[in-house]
């Protein structure tokens, strides 16, 4: 009861708080549970008690065990237990599960990763952050106070993040690291009336006769996975498959891309060896989902050559 697990790495600082709540003015006595021996309060000791905090500066594997704290208020004595485990440093990059703090989830809108337990320490900014043991670099990552902010979170930002900072005690510096997993969750999806990003409505595209050209129909349908979302080209109001002109083909399959978290679909109309008659056709980009159909029309025109004298 009233027991709290704490862990750390050898040769790093570890500070543990008594798991009983109280005022900072309350007297707190700390003991080794196994021996009932009192833990000293003098700071010259490597392991010493400081009010509600028990400090290992630095920690050793042999410090592992259960520590008892008794919080003495004027009206009650409350007992708590700190179950401390100190591990040897890992030779490789792998952070074992038993060294991991709670997993945090982020999304495009909220991507804060707090450095666990840092509030117990006397540290100064900035924190160093690592992902899967690699130092984080680039403008997407911002170390802010005790947390890391990731801009434009993507699914591959998921992973194990380690914060590293220095604890200062009476002029002496001690390193501390803490690792937690970060998962990226899709924000709640929604669908909306199709928005065609390309082509613009009633656009005209200049083409060279005899050359090849591509027309892209691109539309967005909402956020997250969409139940029904298709884009397609029509020629003079007819499906491409009904239009018997092998030079004009709509590419198989539709690329699904996510722009600003929106679910967008593209399809490309490929016209080989552009002919004069192609300029007479009406090209319709159609976007369809459960909300309805939107149509943007584009026409082709001959490219004008400007002769320079």
């Amino acid at each position: 009861k009233f027991s709290k697990q704490s862990w750390g790495l050898e040769n790093e600082a570890l500070i543990v708080r008594c798991p009983r709540q109280g005022k900072s003015s309350y007297i707190v006595d700390w003991y080794y549970s196994q021996t009932n021996k009192s833990i000293p309060t003098q700071e010259r000791n490597r392991v010493f008690a400081s009010g509600q905090l028990l400090k290992f500066l630095p920690a050793e594997v042999a410090d592992s065990g259960i520590y008892t704290c008794i919080v003495r208020s004027p009206t009650f004595n409350r007992t708590g237990y700190a179950n401390v485990t100190i591990y040897k440093k890992q030779p490789d990059c792998n952070v074992p599960d038993y060294l991991m703090y709670s997993t945090v989830s982020g999304s495009e809108k909220n991507s804060k990763i707090y450095c666990p337990t840092i509030d117990l320490y006397n540290w100064t900014a900035p924190l160093e952050w690592f992902k899967n043991c690699q130092a984080l670099q680039g403008s997407r990552y911002k170390a802010h106070k005790s947390f890391l902010v990731i801009d434009n979170v993507m699914t591959d930002d998921a992973g194990d993040y380690t914060c590293k900072f220095i604890h200062n005690e009476n002029g002496a510096n001690y390193s501390v690291t803490a690792t937690r997993s970060f998962t990226v969750k899709d924000e709640q999806g929604f669908s909306l009336f199709p928005v065609i990003r390309a082509p613009a409505h009633n656009e005209t595209k200049e083409v060279e006769i005899g050359e090849n050209t591509n027309l892209t129909c691109s539309a967005c349908f909402g956020k997250g996975a969409q139940f029904l979302a298709t884009v397609q080209w029509q020629l003079n109001g007819n499906k491409i498959t009904d239009f018997s002109e092998p030079r004009i083909q709509q590419e198989e399959g539709q690329n699904q891309s996510f722009s600003n978290g929106l679910a967008c679909v593209n399809t490309v109309l490929r016209i080989a060896d552009v002919k004069e008659e192609d300029l007479l056709l009406r090209y319709d980009c159609l976007a369809l989902n459960l909300h309805g159909l939107r149509r943007h029309t584009i026409r082709l025109s001959r490219k004008h050559h400007h002769h320079h004298h």
Epitope: K1, F2, Q21, G22, K23, S25, Y26, V71, S73, P74, T75, F76, R78
Partner: antibody
Framework: EVQLVQSGAEVKKPGATVKISCKVS????????MHWVQQAPGKGLEWMGR????????EYAEKFQGRVTITADTSTDTAYMELSSLRSEDTAVYYC??????????WGQGTLVTVSS | DIQMTQSPSTLSASVGDRVTITCITN??????IHWYQQKPGKAPKLLIY???TLRPGVPSRFSGSGSGTEFTLTISSLQPDDFATYYC????????FGQGTKLEIK
Amino acid sequence: EVQLVQSGAEVKKPGATVKISCKVSAFNIKDDYMHWVQQAPGKGLEWMGRIDPAIGNTEYAEKFQGRVTITADTSTDTAYMELSSLRSEDTAVYYCATGDFYAMAYWGQGTLVTVSS
Amino acid sequence: DIQMTQSPSTLSASVGDRVTITCITNTDIDDVIHWYQQKPGKAPKLLIYEGNTLRPGVPSRFSGSGSGTEFTLTISSLQPDDFATYYCLQSDNMLTFGQGTKLEIK
């Protein structure tokens, strides 16, 4: 012997505000928490909230949130509980009690507040 | 919010009886339960804190037990002074009293 002495009974109209005091003797109010408890006639005890007088931190039960304000004057070792927008169901005995974060050890004698038009 | 269900609401017993009052919570509260006795017109008095720690000056016939979600107050041999209302209090999350148990003479 720790003693908590509360202010006298009050009669208030609906919509009014009442402020009850609780003076502590043989004890430094800063050294512990001060809790307030409501007991309607013939009913059970209902915790209202607590204050850490040394720093002024307060926590209130959801039921009273927004209507109750607990304060403390450490220079006079006196705690106060103010309840606003009074209604008939606030008719009750109000107790102050000192203790730690988790429980109350010493109690005041109680203050009866009657809300009536 | 943590809900407390105290039972029974009324208990009739005689001097010398062994009586048990129970408090059940809707979530594990890690022994942060306390027992109070209240007599008519008086402030409550703390009997037991932290599940089973007897407050100084409280007779040893009072005892507390239980853990997790079910807690009991036992009076091993009722004395005339024990007829009162008893409340459990949880302080795992804020503070919540049980509804009370009125212990009356049979």
